[in-house]
Interface confidence: low
């Protein structure tokens, strides 16, 4: 998929692209191809639609093989009645500095959240809201009974005075992680994303994982028992190898997939886990990608509409969101 080979185009004539999909030159300047759309997998040879402000997000500089088409501008955020652009930072109050990242808001507290233990010169620390000050501050109360000082010092430990523990880099971080978005494909290999600041420097970052709700070639409706309307998690007879842009998983997996219903309900993953999967490509390169593995599925009427560009936003509820 790199540009080192001479141009070899799949067809001499330009391909016919679906309505609304741009016809562009591939990343090697060789062949005219249909541009990849938001959330789709992209490579150097399969570029994203530039007319929609999309770029191929490879995740890390080391991985230049397969990325996900991402909006340059990202989805805006609505927070406290105001609309913020992706990447825009704002103060939601004097206590929090927030950032909008592709439709999700993450906030970092501006006020110190340190813990103060009793010490000889401040045996009874207490946080109070002082007039004209935004952040609460520590004050040292005088004990009513001087003899109470002794037991209070039992909690004072010498090691607490020897500087900050490097593992406490995030002491001032209000850790927030959105739920994983719905898989971008209802069948076959897709992408699921989330936003988190659960990292060393409390920076908002977008994470992605591969996902497969069900294989496209499986005719699951055939397996629905008589009198039943759904098959929630059909048994997949044999272990499978996952395929990703011409690369194949090194191991086989006995994965669970979600089934289908005949009464208008849709079955989607309910409980999932994320595991790394190694893919081997025809040029011998091995790449590791995180992938969703389904534990349980649920069948329900809350089905996202086909081709709904806001589909993934329905799943963007923040854990511990302050709104």
């Amino acid at each position: 998929q790199d540009c080192s080979a001479q141009c070899q185009c799949a067809a001499e004539a330009a391909p016919h692209c679906p309505a609304g999909v741009s016809l562009v030159l591939d990343g090697c300047g060789c062949c005219r191809v249909c541009a990849k759309q938001l959330g789709e997998l992209c490579t150097e040879r399969d570029p994203c639609d530039p007319h929609k402000g999309l770029f191929c997000d490879f995740g890390s500089p080391a991985n230049r093989k397969i990325g996900v088409c991402t909006a340059k501008d990202g989805a805006p955020c609505v927070f406290g009645g105001s609309v913020y652009r992706s990447g825009e930072s704002f103060q939601s109050s004097c206590k929090y500095q927030c950032t909008c990242l592709d439709g999700a808001v993450g906030c970092v507290p501006l006020c110190s959240m340190d813990v103060r233990l009793p010490s000889p010169d401040c045996p009874f620390p207490r946080r109070v809201k002082l007039p004209g000050k935004c952040c609460e501050e520590w004050v040292c109360d005088e004990p009513k009974d001087r003899t109470a000082v002794g037991p209070a010092l039992a909690a004072y430990r010498l090691e607490d005075t020897f500087g900050p523990d490097p593992t406490m880099m995030r002491a001032n971080c209000l850790v927030q992680t959105t739920e994983w978005s719905a898989c971008s494909k209802t069948c076959g290999m897709g992408i699921s994303t989330r936003v988190t600041n659960d990292n060393t420097f409390c920076r908002l970052e977008k994470q992605s994982r591969l996902c497969m709700v069900r294989p496209c070639e499986a005719d699951l409706e055939e397996n629905i028992k008589k009198g039943k309307k759904c098959i929630r998690t059909p048994k997949i007879a044999k272990p499978v190898k996952f395929e990703l842009s011409g690369c194949t998983s090194v191991k086989t997996y006995r994965a669970k997939f979600c089934g289908v219903c005949t009464d208008g309900r849709c079955c989607t993953p309910h409980r999932t886990t994320t595991l790394p999967v190694e893919f081997k490509c025809p040029d011998g390169e091995i790449m590791k990608k995180n992938m969703m593995f389904i534990k349980t599925c649920a069948c329900h009427y809350n089905c996202p509409g086909d081709n709904d560009i806001f589909e993934s936003l329905y799943y963007r509820k923040m854990y511990g969101d302050m709104a």
Epitope: A10, D283, G284, E285
Partner: antibody, heavy 114, light 110 residues
Framework: EVTLKESGPVLVKPTETLTLTCTVS????????VHWIRQPPGKGLEWLGV???????DYNAAFMSRLTISKDTSKSQVVFTMTNMDPVDTATYYC????????WGQGTTVTVSS | ETVVTQEPSFSVSPGGTVTLTCRSS?????????ANWVQQTPGQAFRGLIG???NRAPGVPDRFSGSILGNKAALTITGAQADDESDYYC?????????FGGGTKLTVLG
């Protein structure tokens, strides 16, 4: 012009080791991988292995224990080594460029006989 | 063991169209099998025609095209010519290795 040329012994004794060299021109071994394929007399093609442009190798599982492919990019040479040769290994051995097996060498016929 | 099967022989009239196929013993052929088609001329020389399912090698005329038809890889030759009379081999990639088919001997009648 892209060319590949195999060279090596035409006769090998059973149990001996076969070493063939594929010398390429018109392209760089850091840009394209090279495959090794053989064709026994009157039969079809059998894929043996490949050395990719980044130096990784893949082998036909049936020959994994006997086969080694290496390269010297600066000399534009790929070296193919097969140990413990047997009369059934008598064939014409080819190297071919990766990328649709688009260019092939003319082949070198190797006979395994005592 | 994975087996790749091709029609042993095929014939076509000059100017006619012929489609040679390549079947995998372990399921449908997909683009991830990177189907390759190689021509061996009567003089024993090899040249690659198609790589990566449908990409023509340099210098290959557009009479040759590669595709996936149903669950098989296919090589279609339109406007067949006398010098297309050759053996045609397909090769499929399976994660760590290629497997060649047994080859198809194409005869151009006349």
């Amino acid at each position: 012009e892209v060319t590949l040329k195999e060279s090596g012994p035409v006769l090998v004794k059973p149990t001996e080791t076969l070493t063939l060299t594929c010398t390429v021109s018109g392209f760089s071994l850091s840009t394209f991988g090279v495959h090794w394929i053989r064709q026994p007399p009157g039969k079809g093609l059998e894929w043996l292995g490949v050395i990719w442009r980044r130096g990784g190798t893949d082998y036909n599982a049936a020959f994994m224990s006997r086969l080694t492919i290496s390269k010297d990019t600066s000399k534009s040479q790929v070296v193919f080594t097969m140990t413990n040769m047997d009369p059934v290994d008598t064939a014409t051995y080819y190297c071919a460029r990766d990328g649709g097996f688009d260019y092939w060498g003319q082949g070198t016929t190797v006979t395994v006989s005592s | 063991e994975t087996v790749v099967t091709q029609e042993p022989s095929f014939s076509v009239s000059p100017g006619g169209t012929v489609t040679l196929t390549c079947r995998s013993s372990i399921g449908a052929v997909t683009t991830s099998n990177y189907a390759n088609w190689v021509q061996q001329t009567p003089g024993q020389a090899f040249r690659g025609l198609i790589g990566g399912t449908s990409n023509r090698a340099p210098g290959v005329p557009d009479r040759f095209s590669g595709s996936i038809l149903g669950n098989k890889a296919a090589l279609t030759i339109t406007g067949a010519q006398a010098d297309d009379e050759s053996d045609y081999y397909c090769a499929l990639w399976y994660s760590t290795h290629y497997v060649f088919g047994g080859g198809t001997k194409l005869t151009v009648l006349g």
